[in-house]
């Protein structure tokens, strides 16, 4: 399965939209910073078969979509930007789902992939727990926005590596 160039562009558009969503200066939230322990090794495409990498990407985008589809998220962000952002993520999920179906037929995905997906889920659990602990404050959302921008940047790099493998 060849991930279309439009998928990468969609990811870039999602990053740009997320960058525009801020309502307060990140510099007023320096104290709120938190180490979410991003599972960087899961974004290293070198150690994965293609099917594994695609399902990690899918999980990453799915969890991001879920995070920004909550009522608390709707209250935190400007509605039209949030809708555009969610639309970009939804389109990427569709692209990736088609690829997952195609690739899993070609390669049997070993248990290692389940570990990778679990690592991504736990990472998003840590993000959600942080938001709950900080009572979904504007600064907590600002920190989460920065973190998701980081993880989307990692996933963009993983996509580039996948295309180079093709």
């Amino acid at each position: 399965c060849d991930l279309p160039q439009t998928h990468s562009l969609g990811n870039r558009r999602a990053l740009i939209l997320l960058g525009q969503m801020g309502r307060i200066s990140p510099f007023s939230c320096l104290k709120d910073r938190h180490d979410f322990r991003i599972p960087q090794e899961e974004f290293d495409g070198n150690q994965f078969q293609k099917a594994q990498a695609i399902s990690v990407l899918h999980e990453m985008i799915q969890q991001t979509f879920n995070l920004f589809s909550t009522e608390d998220s709707s209250a935190a962000w400007e509605q039209s930007l949030l809708e555009k952002f969610s639309t970009e993520l939804y389109q990427q999920l569709n692209d990736l789902e088609a690829c997952v179906i195609q690739e899993v037929g070609v390669e049997e995905t070993p248990l290692m992939n389940e570990d990778s997906i679990l690592a991504v889920r736990k990472y998003f659990q840590r993000i959600t727990l942080y938001l709950i602990e900080r009572k979904y404050s504007p600064c907590a959302w600002e920190v989460v926005r920065a973190e998701i921008m980081r993880s989307l940047s990692f996933s963009t790099n993983l996509q580039k590596r996948l295309r180079r493998k093709d």
């Epitope: 990140p26 104290k31 910073r33 938190h34 180490d35 900080r134 920065a146 980081r150």
Partner: antibody, heavy 121, light 113 residues
Framework: QVQLVQSGAEVKKPGSSVKVSCKAS????????ISWVRQAPGQGLEWMGG????????NYAQKFQGRVTITADESTSTAYMELSSLRSEDTAVYYC??????????????WGQGTLVTVSS | DIVMTQSPDSLAVSLGERATINCKSS????????????LAWYQQKPGQPPKLLIY???TRESGVPDRFSGSGSGTDFTLTISSLQAEDVAVYYC?????????FGQGTKVEIK
């Protein structure tokens, strides 16, 4: 290993501008804030401002507002500090320092080697 | 802006003896949401950039010898060098990162008596 490498020493005339660069390697550039700190000869440390590359958002100390511009180029992992309307009292060593936005403490954990800017007619 | 005041301005201590530097902030740098003090200590030797020693008022940066320790909370902080070594001769700065603009103390010069 994270490294911040700054551009070389500059000699400038009063009223002119200087632009100092700071190239980062060995870390995820966009995940951090880059601060600029200056130190006049024999004096203490003074925070001028900073930028969070992932947002492109800069913040400046009131003293330098309107005279300093801090930018970042994610594609080259380089931050820049431009100071305009230079006067003799701007003669100092200018440092860039990484502030771990992407981590869980706020401290300047890696520093550039410093750039001496001399303002003299 | 938060004003940071260090004392003393300079300090002469015999090798192997204890050196104590104080730092006072004009307002609390303790953040109630995570109970952390946003105060750091740096060491600067001549011709070199500052080096981070302590963050969160009392957490040693990795690789920093355990003779360096930080304490205090709210507005009053202390950096202690338990047994001064020749290589500890430097200027020490406290810095708050509770709010922008970040501000530094004026520095304390530590020398050997």
């Amino acid at each position: 290993q994270v490294q911040l490498v700054q551009s070389g020493a500059e000699v400038k005339k009063p009223g002119s501008s200087v632009k100092v660069s700071c190239k980062a390697s060995g870390g995820t550039f966009s995940s951090y804030a880059i601060s600029w700190v200056r130190q006049a000869p024999g004096q203490g440390l003074e925070w001028m401002g900073g930028i969070i590359p992932i947002f492109g958002t800069a913040n400046y100390a009131q003293k330098f507002q309107g005279r300093v511009t801090i930018t970042a180029d994610e594609s080259t992992s380089t931050a820049y500090m431009e100071l305009s309307s230079l006067r003799s009292e701007d003669t100092a060593v200018y440092y860039c320092a990484r502030d771990s936005w992407g981590s869980y403490y706020a401290a300047l954990d890696y520093w550039g080697q410093g750039t001496l800017v001399t303002v003299s007619s | 802006d938060i004003v940071m005041t260090q004392s003393p301005d300079s300090l002469a201590v015999s090798l192997g003896e204890r050196a104590t530097i104080n730092c006072k902030s004009s307002q609390s740098v303790l953040y109630s949401s995570n109970n952390k003090n946003y105060l750091a200590w740096y060491q600067q030797k001549p011709g070199q950039p500052p080096k981070l020693l302590i963050y969160w008022a009392s957490t040693r940066e990795s690789g920093v010898p355990d003779r360096f320790s930080g304490s205090g909370s709210g507005t009053d902080f202390t950096l202690t060098i338990s047994s001064l070594q020749a290589e500890d001769v430097a200027v020490y700065y406290c810095q708050q990162s509770f709010d922008v603009p970040y501000t530094f103390g004026q520095g304390t010069k530590v020398e050997i008596k």
